[in-house]
């Protein structure tokens, strides 16, 4: 979904009450410590020498909200992603290098702690690069791992 | 195998609700979204709205409103549909359908449908 | 909201013949499109997903195809059993949306 099209039908009012506490998660693990902010998240990368995975979703997408249950429910990815500072953003940052290829949702970006955004690692379709669906765990897991591999250790 | 099986069908008064019921089997409940489609006669097919029934997250089509509720209950691998306040252009065939195996949003496979009749 | 645009509405053809059905969308669905066929009294069953990705236990004669805008399903010979209604479905955005339907009628 390309983020500057705006959907056409509103959540019922129903859907707006949390059933838990709200947090920077979003839903998209409650346990893992989320950052608020890219300034914030690029900061941390830099000083903890963690690469950073930068979410960009919309609470109207079905596509977000799909991605988002299989990555808080696979075990896997939630023991991976404590590795990593993290960040998901339902709006779009003015770093133009988090959106390479255009602002659709969900797409997962990494960005090394060098700061420099790995336009290398993407998912599996050629038309939305770092996009991924719930059948695309794997190699989500599999790209995690890869920017996990940092592009220049500190020392 | 996967299977649908929704309650029988309903005659309802102006203005009563209506309580539909899906019972699944053959896969894992909790992590397929759940749509509900309605088929008015001789007409063709309307999304109503999904459910996950992991954590009861919902998504409703604008269209109904405040009228509409999707629950589901873990125990019983079920979930329901009620439509409030009837009107008689709500007499239509109201089927489930589950999302795909992997949790993605297409809709896979359909209950039998449940015909609701509303009429004073 | 999205909106579906079959065609043609009734499509008259005899066993044996290749059917072509369209589905335009009111904007770009990625591929985010699935197909359905339904026969009268029944409910309807799942033939494509993702615009082109058949579903297990779908005969190879059905195919879908396209992208963005403009979808096609494709029986490549027809059989008996084909002759139905046949509607397209997307789900990029809320609330999915049905095209009209296309009849597939014995000429």
């Known amino acids: 979904k390309d983020t500057t099209v705006k959907s056409g039908a509103k959540k019922d009012p129903k859907d707006s009450r949390p059933k838990l506490p709200q947090t920077l998660s979003r839903g998209w693990g409650d346990q893992l410590i989320w950052t608020q902010t890219y300034e914030e998240a690029l900061y941390r990368s830099k000083t903890s020498n963690r690469p950073l995975m930068v979410i960009h979703h919309l609470d109207e997408c079905p596509h977000s909200q799909a991605l988002k249950k299989v990555f808080a429910e696979h075990k896997e990815i939630q023991k991976l992603a404590e590795q990593f500072v993290l960040l998901n953003l339902v709006y779009e940052t003015t770093d133009k290098h988090l959106s390479p290829d255009g602002q659709y949702v969900p797409r997962i970006v990494f960005v090394d702690p060098s700061l420099t955004v790995r336009a290398d690692i993407t998912g599996r379709y050629s038309n939305r690069l770092y996009a991924y669906e719930p059948s695309d765990t794997a190699l989500l897991y599999d790209n995690m791992k890869k920017a996990l591999k940092l592009l220049k250790t500190e020392l | 195998q996967v299977q649908l099986v929704q309650s029988g069908a309903e005659v309802k008064k102006p203005g009563a609700s209506v309580k539909v019921s899906c019972k699944t089997s053959g896969y894992v409940f909790s992590r397929s979204w759940m749509n509900w489609v309605r088929q008015a006669p001789g007409q063709g097919l309307e999304w109503i709205g999904w459910i996950y029934p992991g954590d009861g997250d919902t998504n409703y089509n604008g269209k109904f409103k405040d009228r509409v509720t999707l629950t589901a209950d873990k125990s019983t691998s079920t979930v329901y549909m009620e439509l409030s306040s009837l009107r008689s252009e709500d007499t239509a065939v109201y089927f489930c359908?589950?999302?795909?195996?992997?949790?993605?949003?297409?809709?896979?496979?359909w209950g039998q449908g449940t015909l609701v009749t509303v009429s004073s | 909201e999205i909106v579906l645009t079959q065609s043609p509405a009734t499509l008259s053809l005899s066993p044996g013949e290749r059917a072509t059905l369209s589905c335009k969308a009111s904007q770009d669905i990625n591929s985010y499109l699935s197909w359905f066929q339904q026969k009268p009294g029944q409910a309807p069953r799942t033939l494509i997903y993702?615009?082109?990705r058949l579903v297990d236990g779908i005969p190879a004669r059905f195919s879908g195809s396209g992208s963005g805008q403009d979808f096609t399903l494709t029986i490549s010979s027809l059989e008996p059993e084909d002759f139905a209604v046949y509607y397209c479905l997307q789900y990029d955005e809320f609330p999915f949306t049905f095209g009209g339907g296309t009849k597939v009628e014995i000429k």
């Open positions: 359908a589950r999302g795909g195996y992997d949790g993605s949003p297409w809709l896979s496979y």
């Open positions: 993702r615009a082109n």
